[in-house]
Structures are given as structure tokens and as C-alpha cells.
Amino acid sequence: KESCDVQLYIKRQSYHSIFAGDPFKLECPVKYCAHRPQVTWCKLNGTTCVKLEGRHTSWKQEKNLSFFILHFEPVLPSDNGSYRCSANFLSAIIESHSTTLYVTDVKSASERPSKDEMASRPWLLYS
């Protein structure tokens, strides 16, 4: 029997290698049964996750899943870091795993490195 708990499908230790100046959509896949929960994004600052207010977000509906999307228009160097989405469901908070954005500033890179290079070359990244 399928669980009717809200589930947030962000993989643990997942990451995205992206470039400053590009648009980017960070998706939080949400599974729910009856009523869509309220979902928010936050950005980790040490062990605290700071709620992102006033940012462009949207919902996308697919067959078995909804996606709560945080829009970066465009990506800024300061967007580098780890993000988490959370759902408010029956007065409980369900938190996703965090996902990390590795932002490369194209001005400081002579050519665009591969995403594997970016994830393994912290000197290219903003903290």
C-alpha cells in the first residue's frame, strides 16, 4: 500500500554545476495524496537553513508528482551553496535532503569546465 505521507524527492548529496549569468530552475519534486502542501525553499548557512523570501517560485504538475521550483534569473555567484525544500503537512514539517549548487563565474574561467571538474575543483567555486 502506497504511503500517503508527503515525500520530497531530492537525493542526498546531490548537486548541480551551473554558471553565473545563466537561468536555472531548482526543482523540489513533491508527492502528496489529497491536498498539496505548502512548500518553501531555504538556503543553508552552517547548520541553519534560512528561508528564502520574495523569490520567484512556481509549481509544475506532472502525472504522479508536483514540482516546486525556485527560479534563478539569472544565477549569481552568491547563489553558490546548499538548498533544502520543506513541506508543511498536517502541522508537521517534512524536510528534503539538501542539494548543492556549484556556481562557476564564467569571467574567472577561461573556458567552461565540465560539471565533474567543477564539483571537484573548489577553487573555481564561490563560497
Epitope: Q7, L8, Y9, I10, K11, R12, Q13, S14, Y15, H16, S17, L44, T47, E95, H97, S98, K115, D116, A119
Partner: antibody
Framework: EVQLVESGGGLVQPGRSLRLSCTTS????????IHWFRQAPGKGLEWVGR????????KYTASFKGRATISADGSKSIAYLQMNSLKTEDTAVYYC????????????WGQGTLVTVSS | DVVMTQSPLSLPVTLGQPASISCRSS???????????LNWLQQRPGQSPRRLIY???KRDSGVPDRFSGSGSGTDFTLKISRVEAEDVGVYYC?????????FGQGTKLEIK
């Protein structure tokens, strides 16, 4: 029924390359991380690296970086381990394993494939 | 890299008796999400490994309840309450909190 079946092992000469395949079934590979491990004869287990079939992102143990490439074809539910510049000390049984990425709900291992590096 | 140290490396046990394996990590395995990613694998002779325990103490489906895991931080234990003949093999702890993921040396359980 869940299955992970490795193939592509065998005898290979030092300095050559080899591509191992891991054919999966019974679950959605995109919900998992695909790991490759190896075990030299009579020795313990060693993590080679992992791939996220949903987006192609990979992580490796430092000693394999640049010599190993892990990839996956989500549409075919197959993962690969490409090993270059093989040495005799790469002789081992190579295992793929699939670990659910969201809630740790499962961790399946294949039966392994033996790679022997010898001239 | 996180060093995982298991003891004992060899464990002769009488059938029906309990067994205990220790695993210590060189740094805490507590992740920033508040969970501890410490796993135990069983490898029977001539077979591939299988996951027994994950998140320190959660048993995989199909794993008998005579197996239990405990611990926190850097100190972990796998216990078998009553050893059976099918438990013979090598047991490994491994951590997937920190990259690169690392294993203990393995503990060989045999029947006395």
C-alpha cells in the same frame, strides 16, 4: 524481481582499457545512485565511485579519478564502469550496487564480475 | 579520508551464542541532516555482499531480527543475538556520510 547483473569482465593485458556493464531491472534506476565497488582476491571491499543516473553527476575515490569513468543510461537501465590504463593490481571482482537516493529504502548488489589484469 | 576500524578481525562463535562486532570511525559520521550513514554488509563465502543494516540500526527487509545495529558518532556495533550456521561469512561496516566512502577491514565470523 530486482536484479543487477554485471558483465564485461575477463582477462585483459596491462595498459589496456575495459568497460564493465551493470544491467538493472525491477526498480527505477533514476531513483538511485549506482555505485561501483571492487574486491581484490582475498581482500576487503573498496568504493570506486558512484553515478546519479538522473543527471549524470559522478563522484570518485581519488585513486580512481582520471582513470575510471562511471556513467549510466537511464532509458536502458544500464550503468557502466570504464577503466583505463589497467594495472595488475586492478585484478579484482567488480560489483555494481544500486542505493535508493531519497530515503535509503534499499541497497541492492550485483553478483560481481571478475577482471584479471595479466600479460 | 575517514578510516574505519573493525574489531575483532576474526570471530569464532559457538552456534546459538551471541556475537558482537565493533566498528570505529576516525571522525564523526553524523551528517548535517542529523542522520548517521553507517551501514553493515554481510558477505557469505563465494557470494556478493548484501546490505544488512543501514542508518546505524535499521534492518533491511528480509534480515532476521537476531541482527541489530547500534552506536553513534564514531562508535558502532553489530550484534547477532544467536548465531546460526548461515551467518558464517565476512561482515563489513562502511560509511557514506563523507566522500570518499570507506569500509572497515571486515570481520570473519566462523563457527567454533
Amino acid at each position: 524481481e530486482v536484479q543487477l547483473v554485471e558483465s564485461g569482465g575477463g582477462l585483459v593485458q596491462p595498459g589496456r582499457s575495459l568497460r564493465l556493464s551493470c544491467t538493472t531491472s525491477g526498480f527505477n534506476i533514476k531513483d538511485t545512485y549506482i555505485h561501483w565497488f571492487r574486491q581484490a582476491p582475498g581482500k576487503g571491499l573498496e568504493w570506486v565511485g558512484r553515478n546519479d543516473p538522473a543527471n549524470g553527476n559522478t563522484k570518485y575515490t581519488a585513486s580512481f579519478k582520471g582513470r575510471a569513468t562511471i556513467s549510466a543510461d537511464g532509458s536502458k537501465s544500464i550503468a557502466y564502469l570504464q577503466m583505463n590504463s589497467l594495472k595488475t593490481e586492478d585484478t579484482a571482482v567488480y560489483y555494481c550496487a544500486s542505493y535508493e537516493g531519497y530515503y535509503e529504502r534499499f541497497g541492492y548488489w550485483g553478483q560481481g564480475t571478475l577482471v584479471t589484469v595479466s600479460s | 579520508d575517514v578510516v574505519m576500524t573493525q574489531s575483532p578481525l576474526s570471530l569464532p562463535v559457538t552456534l546459538g551464542q551471541p556475537a558482537s562486532i565493533s566498528c570505529r570511525s576516525s571522525q564523526s559520521l553524523l551528517d548535517r541532516d542529523g542522520k548517521t550513514y553507517l551501514n553493515w554488509l554481510q558477505q557469505r563465502p563465494g557470494q556478493s555482499p548484501r546490505r544488512l543494516i543501514y542508518l546505524v540500526s535499521k534492518r533491511d527487509s528480509g534480515v532476521p531480527d537476531r541482527f541489530s545495529g547500534s552506536g553513534s558518532g564514531t562508535d558502532f556495533t553489530l550484534k547477532i543475538s544467536r548465531v546460526e550456521a548461515e551467518d558464517v561469512g565476512v561482515y563489513y561496516c562502511w560509511q557514506d556520510t563523507h566522500f570518499p566512502y570507506t569500509f572497515g577491514q571486515g570481520t570473519k565470523l566462523e563457527i567454533k
